[in-house]
């Protein structure tokens, strides 16, 4: 997945450290894992585990690696070409509407509804009406039955900022 870059992502490094590898830009751009020098003549490698760039770019800095929050697990570490992949801990999920935090999955469905989908790192349990089979869109059920969900096995990683 491709990230959109925001102000906070830029790593505060303007000068290349002596050990950083350099190469020449291609058509004014540097390859993934590099950023362009201020004079535009060199491509400077990102620092492994500290910053990264995922696409061809003319970025003056590589982007700072994300650190997973508490309540998240690190699925894969930051490399020079890919940001850290963080995923919500078991029993919690991250919605697209609120990507900043992991929220607790509900433990059961409201009365008159049945569970058809487990808690995953990117979705709450899914409930449908017993009769009609229509989905329940409410945030928190008013009354819960004793139907509980065990966290589902992730089918694919959910990248917050990769």
């Amino acid at each position: 997945e491709s990230a959109l870059i925001t102000q906070q992502d830029l790593a505060p490094q303007q000068r290349a450290a002596p050990q950083q590898k350099r190469s020449s830009p291609s058509e004014g751009l540097c390859p993934p894992g590099h950023h362009i020098s201020e004079d535009g003549r060199d491509c400077i490698s990102c620092k492994y585990g500290q910053d990264y760039s995922t696409h061809w770019n003319d970025l003056l800095f590589c982007l700072r690696c994300t650190r997973c929050d508490s309540g998240e697990v690190e699925l894969s570490p930051c490399t020079t070409t890919r940001n850290t992949v963080c995923q919500c801990e078991e029993g919690t999920f991250r919605e697209e509407d609120s990507p900043e935090m992991c929220r607790k999955c509900r433990t059961g469905c409201p009365r008159g509804m049945v569970k058809v989908g487990d808690c995953t790192p990117w979705s709450d349990i899914e409930c449908v009406h017993k009769e009609s089979g229509t989905k329940h869109s409410g945030e928190v059920p008013a009354v819960e039955e004793t139907v509980t969900s065990s966290p589902g096995t992730p089918a694919s990683p959910c990248s917050l900022s990769g």
């Epitope: 997945e1 491709s2 990230a3 959109l4 870059i5 925001t6 102000q7 906070q8 992502d9 830029l10 950023h35 362009i36 770019n57 003319d58 970025l59 003056l60 800095f61 982007l63 994300t66 940001n83 697209e96 509407d97 609120s98 990507p99 900043e100 990248s159 917050l160 900022s161 990769g162």
Partner: nanobody
Framework: EVQLLESGGGEVQPGGSLRLSCAAS????????MGWFRQAPGKEREFVSA????????YYAESVKGRFTISRDDAKSTLYLQMSSLRAEDTAVYYC??????????????????WGQGTLVTVKP
């Protein structure tokens, strides 16, 4: 809430050029990352290019490197995509996207961004 309106799409011959514009309204976009994605018929939406805040640099997909140039005019709250040396495989609906907050690294097509309605670019002889 941000509204995004793309324009500039159309039909062009291979090798031709087009300039897409994306006008943002609802808030100032100067501190926000913006970008372009595209979706060809029957294919997944794919990243094209992104512009970092404050002219700190840009990102390009390898498929458009050297042919497309992204730029922005924060005073006009407008993002541009200059497309040249267009190929048949560039035919797609092009979508403008803006990050929801300046603090959070917002993800791509499946993430929490604001999306425009899209503008169709057709490249054919």
């Amino acid at each position: 809430e941000v509204q995004l309106l793309e324009s500039g799409g159309g039909e062009v011959q291979p090798g031709g050029s087009l300039r897409l514009s994306c006008a943002a309204s609802g808030r100032s976009i100067s501190n926000y990352a913006m970008g372009w994605f595209r979706q060809a018929p029957g294919k997944e939406r794919e990243f094209v290019s992104a512009s970092v805040w404050n002219n700190a640099g840009n990102y390009y997909a390898e498929s458009v490197k050297g042919r497309f140039t992204i730029s922005r005019d924060d005073a006009k709250s407008t993002l541009y995509l200059q497309m040249s040396s267009l190929r048949a495989e560039d035919t797609a609906v092009y979508y403008c996207v803006v990050a929801r907050t300046p603090e959070t690294p917002i993800t791509s097509a499946r993430g929490a961004n604001y999306w425009g309605q899209g503008t169709l670019v057709t490249v054919k002889p």
